[in-house]
């Protein structure tokens, strides 16, 4: 699979999730999470070859298509498979408050 | 949607599903399908600037800091999101067979 | 600059439901809140509720709680304030501010306003 | 819920001179949880001072904020004709966000 187990121990050059740190103040503009002040979101990059963790029988169809048409602007994209939440703190006035944020983590990437 | 509908009748620069044909011997060299020759498969492609039909928390997250970071290469990508089947006619010998080839085609696309 | 434009007067009758809408432009949507409050004819402002648009989360002030609705739409960057079972004493005019930030805050940026009247 | 009462309910001064328009809370608030806004008729209200002390972008500086705990004040060092309005104070320390009745600023 391509996760974080395998992408951050190794070099792989085709589509795998990568590292990116979000600062929520700085790189969103949100001013209402407290905690954290930010978040490794990760991101998912590189090019999908046949046979690359393809997602769908299209996904397989368009990098054969791809392979056989190296100009086309027609190719799978890396993009996230696992998503997971993030759990952060806000303040309602003086009080805070836990709440979890679904689909915030990237786990592992596929090419669709 | 970013469906067949919208973005076949219009000329939108942002993510959506775009048109493409395959021919399955020249573009595939698939040669055990009998009917049809081709098919249009389609394609996704475009930007996906903020608020353009996100997929997921995430990917709005990912917009909103590929708004505030616009060289940054983490960036929501076009990709399907409906996909229909194609019946397709391939023999056996002199026995032709009918088969449905699931997620052939693509009918609308997201930004994940 | 920053712009919230809301929907126009409306005129209803005792027990049924509002809908105002207020549409922000000039800024990132989602990285803002969104408050509500209202203000009876020569009366003043009272506090209804706001929401986070990005992640959808809405909070009410007590009184409010079960009648009122506060949702985002962020494909047209716009917040929708539904208030039901109306009654004569929620003729007033209606108002979204954007606050500073936080979710409650001071409000920064307001709507024009959008004069509800529940008459019979 | 937190009340804010404000005071004087009426303010009758002439162009020119200082206003003084005090807000005090039923329980303490901190040092920056409350905010001040002008209202004209027939308009939204503008924010002036938010944090207590903290002027909003494009106030004039003849508005300053003061206090902290449970009693804060608006100060116009210098009125203009433009300045005869309503203002209100808002806490935002706890839920509900409450504001004050009001002071009307109006002209001697």
């Known amino acids: 699979a391509l996760d974080t187990n395998y992408c951050f121990s190794s070099t792989e050059k085709n589509c795998c999730v990568r590292q990116l740190y979000i600062d929520f103040r700085k790189d969103l503009g949100w001013k209402w999470i407290h905690e954290p002040k930010g978040y490794h979101a990760n991101f998912c990059l590189g090019p999908c070859p046949y046979i690359w963790s393809l997602d769908t029988q299209y996904s397989k169809v368009l990098a054969l298509y791809n392979q056989h048409n190296p100009g086309a602007s027609a190719a799978p994209c890396c993009v996230p498979q696992a998503l997971e939440p993030l759990p952060i703190v806000y303040y309602v006035g003086r009080k805070p408050k836990v709440e979890q944020l679904s689909n915030m983590i990237v786990r592992s990437c596929k090419c669709s | 949607a970013l469906d067949t509908n919208y973005c076949f009748s219009s000329t939108e620069k942002n993510c959506c599903v775009r048109q493409l044909y395959i021919d399955f011997r020249k573009d595939l060299g698939w040669k055990w399908i009998h009917e049809p020759k081709g098919y249009h498969a389609n394609f996704c492609l475009g930007p996906c600037p903020y608020i353009w039909s996100l997929d997921t928390q995430y990917s709005k997250v990912l917009a909103l800091y590929n708004q505030h970071n616009p060289g940054a290469s983490a960036a929501p990508c076009c990709v399907p999101q409906a996909l229909e089947p194609l019946p397709i006619v391939y023999y056996v010998g002199r026995k032709p067979k009918v088969e449905q080839l699931s997620n052939m085609i693509v009918r609308s696309c997201k930004c994940s | 600059q920053v712009q919230l434009v809301q929907s126009g007067a409306e005129v209803k009758k005792p027990g049924s439901s509002v809908k105002v809408s207020c549409k922000a432009s000039?800024?990132?949507?989602?990285?803002?809140?969104i408050s509500w409050v209202r203000q009876a004819p020569g009366q003043g402002l009272e506090w209804m509720g706001g929401?986070?648009?990005?992640?959808?989360?809405?909070y009410y002030a007590q009184r409010f709680k079960g009648r009122v609705t506060i949702t985002a739409d962020e494909s047209t960057s716009t917040t929708y304030m539904e208030l039901s079972s109306l009654r004569s004493e929620d003729t007033a005019v209606y108002y979204c501010?954007?606050?500073?930030?936080?979710?409650?805050?001071?409000?920064?940026?307001w709507g024009q306003g959008t004069l509800v009247t529940v008459s019979s | 819920e937190t009340v804010l009462t404000q005071s004087p309910g009426t303010l009758s001064l002439s162009p020119g001179e200082r206003a003084t328009l005090s807000c005090r809370a039923s329980?303490?608030?901190?040092?920056?949880?409350l905010a001040w806004y002008q209202q004209k008729p027939g308009q939204a209200p503008r924010l002036l001072i938010y944090?207590?002390?903290s002027r909003a972008p494009g106030i004039p500086d003849r508005f300053s904020g003061s206090g902290s705990g449970t009693d804060f004040t608006l100060t116009i060092s210098r009125l203009e004709p433009e300045d005869f309005a309503v203002y209100y104070c808002?806490?935002?320390?706890?839920?509900?966000?409450?504001f004050g009745q009001g002071t009307r600023l109006e002209i001697k």
């Open positions: 501010a954007s606050t500073l930030g936080l979710v409650l805050d001071a409000m920064d940026y």
């Open positions: 944090g207590a002390s």
């Open positions: 000039g800024y990132t949507f989602s990285s803002n809140v």
């Open positions: 929401v986070i648009p990005i992640v959808d989360i809405a």
């Open positions: 808002q806490q935002y320390a706890d839920s509900p966000i409450t």
């Open positions: 329980q303490s608030l901190g040092s920056s949880y």
